[in-house]
Amino acid sequence: KIDACKRGDVTVKPSHVILLGSTVNITCSLKPRQGCFHYSRRNKLILYKFDRRINFHHGHSLNSQVTGLPLGTTLFVCKLACINSDEIQICGAEIFVGVAPEQPQNLSCIQKGEQGTVACTWERGRDTHLYTEYTLQLSGPKNLTWQKQCKDIYCDYLDFGINLTPESPESNFTAKVTAVNSLGSSSSLPSTFTFLDIVRPLPPWDIRIKFQKASVSRCTLYWRDEGLVLLNRLRYRPSNSRLWNMVNVTKAKGRHDLLDLKPFTEYEFQISSKLHLYKGSWSDWSESLRAQTPEEEPTGMLDVWYMKRHIDYSRQQISLFWKNLSVSEARGKILHYQVTLQELTGGKAMTQNITGHTSWTTVIPRTGNWAVAVSAANSKGSSLPTRINIMNLCEAGLLAPRQVSANSEGMDNILVTWQPPRKDPSAVQEYVVEWRELHPGGDTQVPLNWLRSRPYNVSALISENIKSYICYEIRVYALSGDQGGCSSILGNSKHKAPLSGPHINAITEEKGSILISWNSIPVQEQMGCLLHYRIYWKERDSNSQPQLCEIPYRVSQNSHPINSLQPRVTYVLWMTALTAAGESSHGNEREFCLQGKAN
């Protein structure tokens, strides 16, 4: 009933709660002397379904058979209509349409940790659309039955709130969930389990790692577990890896030795636990422990290269370069590099520790046979030294690689190719491809890059420290014993026309011809390797086409003579530069008048 129903009643048969698809009979009847004031024949009873009129009848009562009600709640209201007055509400009723509960499926129970509480979950099946009560029942030893009822509207989980203890770990318990509503009831299939089946241990905690004698080979992982844990799984990986190493251990009692860790590596460790070999489930993984393994002395050897530069008749400058060891070879923080320089015949040796650099430059006499050894040191020791005999790398002309070419290969890559030297190609022990940014001054401070290539290779892709629109001086060395031959070429990964032309800084007259001097184009405006310069000239105030002279680009050249100018004629001169992509704009214009005699 939805209000006081003083004037009449609404009755519903067979019930206010019906099965979907059922028919109901709704009767609205007026109480005595509650009809229209003058004449009861004029009583008009109207039945509403929500706000929609579905039936009416003149008299003291109305009967209506209703079918096809939807799932959920439907409100019916009976009203009385008298002549010349508003409809008066008599009474109403709610009808609840639903279905009997389906059998709950997939009942499963779990206790998280030895001190946790038992909680069960199940699938309810389709919504009943009615208030449905779920009772979870657990039958156990000693003729005991535990039960708890669910007070939620949609119940598919219940926590008993109490704890199963391991006093009889193999004793059987049987769980069952029963759903009951006004239209029926249904119970799940029973789920039988033991303590060992349903207790999921808490993840291990208080994880620590110890390295005996600061050695990675003597590493023990420690942790704490719940008392009944029998099995553990350990997983660990370097922090920068996605792949785990996995170890299963039995009766570990909270410790395990790890034998295959890499030195000076940050690892992530996690542990999981289980109570029984084949019963129950694994705990969640523990929180991660992150720890760095100790250093070990470096392995591997440095890749060392060098450059020689003539200073004067008695001295030469040696610049040594080496590459960092890989992380796996360094096995720790490299504290310094040890460079030893030795004159092989006289036996004089000089050792120096280099920190913060991977290069070293010194001046030595041009006489004598010199060798260097370079090693890397961390807190635990040094790598094996790399020994190199200093020789003239380009001395053996017959060892010079032939037909060296350098071609752009995609973004910021240059493919260098060559042919073996004329001399017996099988004598070549290795090739070294070296590249550095081309600087007109031949600046020795420009970083040097190199890579080594096996003797049977005739190409190398260089990509390290290659920038677009920069010209590189590329050398290919063929090494054989204590001899070397080399060839060089200029190359770039990407080029376009230079942004500016050379700046003419002076024009001087020499014996009837002129010498033009210019400043190099700034490196950042060259936009690749320059191929040519062009010098243009024409008579001032003339509309004729200018004459031009094209000069092949050479790094060190920045002057050129012209001898085809007429005396006592004023000329305008300018220059451009060309890459493979095209010609620059004009450089500055200079006027010049040759003072020499006319022929």
Epitope: W146, Q147, K148, N163
Partner: nanobody, 125 residues
């Protein structure tokens, strides 16, 4: 101090019903497990039914469907509704209270810290 006081016992014909009450003072019933035990003449005290603080109930299968335990937090009391009584239900019924959090512990006498004096229930045939 903590006191448990049972009431509602008496004599009843077989098939009849009784409702026992247990009024508690000094502790809050909703914080503890509450149990009912009984002792028949010449026998040991045995477990009947209990309710944990989380409202899980446990009973022996011999009384299943005939006995219901309930709790009224507002009145700080626990009740035992007994239906379809049998002569073998004749005993002194004791109310008990304890901080019990385990399944097995709910049915164990030694887990209950506080006890009432008991109330006699007699079922005649």
């Amino acid at each position: 101090q903590v006191q448990l006081q049972e009431s509602g016992g008496g004599s009843v014909q077989a098939g009849g019903s009784l409702r026992l009450s247990c009024a508690v003072s000094g502790r809050t019933v909703s914080d503890y497990a509450m149990g009912w035990f009984r002792q028949a003449p010449g026998k040991e005290r045995e477990f009947v039914v209990a309710m944990s603080s989380s409202e899980t109930t446990v009973y022996t299968n011999s009384v299943k469907g005939r006995i219901t335990i309930s709790r009224d937090n507002a009145k700080n009391a626990v009740y035992l509704q007994m239906n379809a009584l049998k002569p073998e239900d004749t005993a002194v019924y004791y109310c008990s209270m304890g901080p019990i959090t385990t399944f097995q512990g709910l049915a164990r006498q030694n887990e209950y810290h506080y006890w009432g004096q008991g109330t006699q229930v007699t079922v005649s045939s």
